[in-house]
């Protein structure tokens, strides 16, 4: 707390300007009117205040707005935002995307801080859903944002927002998240033609079921191995050698390099060695010729 002291004669601030950088902490407290500061917040950013001086300015705003700052002040916080705690931010009601962008800009290039996470959480909850413009903004600043959400939170993403997602935004998503996002992407891109559809859906395929992979194998998509390796193992296992060959096209020879990685390894173990040999890749580990394969799961379902 800064001690309350009277403002020296002639030092009362009439506007927020560069002269204030020469004020001591107690002078700022005594001579800067909080209401003036609130109306001229946009000037603070252009003035090279010290961290200690910014603490004083924050203190003044906290006194003026004990229930939380209004959006007109929040939008112009600039570097003062870095002084805010998650507790401060929880009092705010941020509804404007412009305000959100202004504050994210301050933190640009850094990891997502607890303050930013709280701000985003408040903003998204206020909107009720993660709309396209918001998602566009958030992923532009934090490519990993989408993958930081739980499957439950992702379920509130409308299919229309999927258009804003770039491949790199999904890099850190796990299979549970892709399980939620894939059906939305399928819906969002359903009216596109074959090759354009594949380009858009490719990043989401880690959530695709077997039947969709089978359908893709009939469309000459030439899936690369990086995408194939991200597919759900349980979705890949039922695919035949012919279907995988069609799905991968010229990339099928890449199976050799990944034969010990999942899902390729598990898929190989399910194929007849004779069928694998037709690929001419030297893949080993298939079911030897003459062996009978019993699908016990099918038997259990029947009994």
């Amino acid at each position: 707390e800064v001690e309350k002291t009277a403002c020296p004669s002639g030092k009362k601030a009439r506007e927020i300007d560069e002269s204030l950088i020469f004020y001591k902490k107690w002078e700022l407290e005594a001579c800067v009117d909080a209401a003036l500061l609130a109306t001229q917040m946009d000037r603070v950013n252009a003035i090279p205040f010290t961290y200690e001086q910014l603490d004083v300015l924050k203190h003044k705003l906290d006194e003026l707005y004990p229930q939380g700052y209004p959006e007109s002040v929040i939008q112009h916080l600039g570097y003062l935002f870095l002084k805010m705690s998650p507790e401060d931010i929880r009092k705010w009601n941020v509804t404007s995307l412009e305000t959100l962008k202004a504050l994210l800009e301050v933190n640009k290039g850094h990891e997502m801080s607890p303050q930013v996470a709280t701000l985003i959480d408040r903003f998204v909850k206020g909107r009720g859903q993660l709309d396209k413009d918001t998602l566009d903004t958030l992923t532009a600043f934090y490519p990993g944002y989408l993958c930081s959400l739980s499957p439950e939170e992702l379920s509130s993403v409308p299919p229309s927002s999927i258009w804003a997602v770039r491949p790199q935004d999904l890099d850190t998503c796990d299979p549970r998240q892709l399980d939620v996002l894939y059906p939305k992407a399928r819906l969002a891109f359903q009216n596109m033609n074959g090759s354009e559809y594949f380009v858009k859906i490719q990043s989401f395929l880690g959530g695709a079921p077997t039947e969709d992979l089978k359908a893709l194998s009939q469309q000459n998509v030439s899936m690369d191995l990086a995408t194939f390796m991200k597919l759900r193992t349980d979705a890949v296992l039922p695919l035949t050698v012919a279907e995988v060959q069609k799905l991968l096209g010229p990339h099928v020879e890449g199976l050799k390099a990944e034969e010990r990685h999942r899902p390729v390894r598990d898929w190989i173990l399910r194929q007849r060695q004779d069928d694998l040999d037709t690929l001419g890749l030297g893949l080993q580990g298939g079911i030897p010729n003459g062996y009978l394969v019993l699908d016990l799961s099918m038997q259990e379902a029947l009994s």
Epitope: P167, A226, E258, G282
Partner: antibody, heavy 119, light 108 residues
Framework: EVQLVQSGAEVKKPGASVKVSCKAS????????MDWVRQAPGQGLEWMGD????????IYNQKFSGRVTMTEDKSASTVYMELSSLRSEDTAVYYC????????????WGQGTTVTVSS | EIVLTQSPATLSLSPGERATLSCSAS???????LSWYQQKPGSSPRLLIY???NLASGIPARFSGSGSGTDYTLTISSLEPEDFAVYYC?????????FGGGTKVEIK
């Protein structure tokens, strides 16, 4: 520019562990596996294993099974190779090398990390 | 595991001469799964040739590769001063992946 930057040289005692990092930049991290290859002084190259940064899946050369662990941090575009129960014959330069998923050759290599095991 | 034996261990030649390096595998290697690397003292290896005969990006045309089955060859048609180095063959046809012991090309 595609780069693999490895952590600095290490000196360890027999029985200890060493963890070497390899930070990737200039390309899509999850489109390439990261392999580790070592080279003992005056010797040839020896493949240790690989990791798929997208899935975290690993394959190890059986020679190192139980002693080597490869991990990744996608958010930092970094892979790690930890070798435990070190012995003097583990003294070598350890390289990370990028391998496009679906190929078996290494098109970009790190600068190498010298690990010396000595009592 | 497949053992790759490189010969000769050392090759002493003059700039402008042709260099022929051999790599012999203990069992058959699918030709798509063989590559060559160059390593200079104090440096990391560099990819020269992949799939037996494909030149890697930025590698001059004086380098070429050939072979099939168990016998593979790297040829440098006319040695330049910067070509004096150690060369390794590498296979990923069979697990674990292995490298040859290397051939050192030195100035005569």
């Amino acid at each position: 520019e595609v780069q693999l930057v490895q952590s600095g040289a290490e000196v360890k005692k027999p029985g200890a562990s060493v963890k070497v990092s390899c930070k990737a930049s200039g390309y899509t991290f999850t489109d390439y596996n990261m392999d580790w290859v070592r080279q003992a002084p005056g010797q040839g190259l020896e493949w240790m294993g690989d990791i798929n940064p997208s899935t975290g899946g690993t394959i190890y050369n059986q020679k190192f099974s139980g002693r080597v662990t490869m991990t990744e941090d996608k958010s930092a575009s970094t892979v790690y190779m930890e070798l435990s129960s070190l012995r003097s014959e583990d003294t070598a330069v350890y390289y990370c090398a990028r391998r496009r998923i679906g190929t078996g050759y290494f098109d970009v290599w790190g600068q190498g990390t010298t690990v010396t095991v000595s009592s | 595991e497949i053992v790759l034996t490189q010969s000769p261990a050392t090759l002493s030649l003059s700039p402008g001469e042709r260099a022929t390096l051999s790599c012999s595998a203990s069992s058959s290697v699918i030709s798509s799964y063989l590559s060559w690397y160059q390593q200079k003292p104090g440096s990391s290896p560099r990819l020269l040739i992949y799939r037996t005969s494909n030149l890697a990006s930025g590698i001059p045309a004086r380098f070429s590769g050939s072979g099939s089955g168990t016998d593979y060859t790297l040829t440098i048609s006319s040695l330049e001063p910067e070509d004096f180095a150690v060369y390794y063959c590498h296979q990923w046809s069979s697990f674990p992946y292995t490298f040859g012991g290397g051939t050192k090309v030195e100035i005569k």
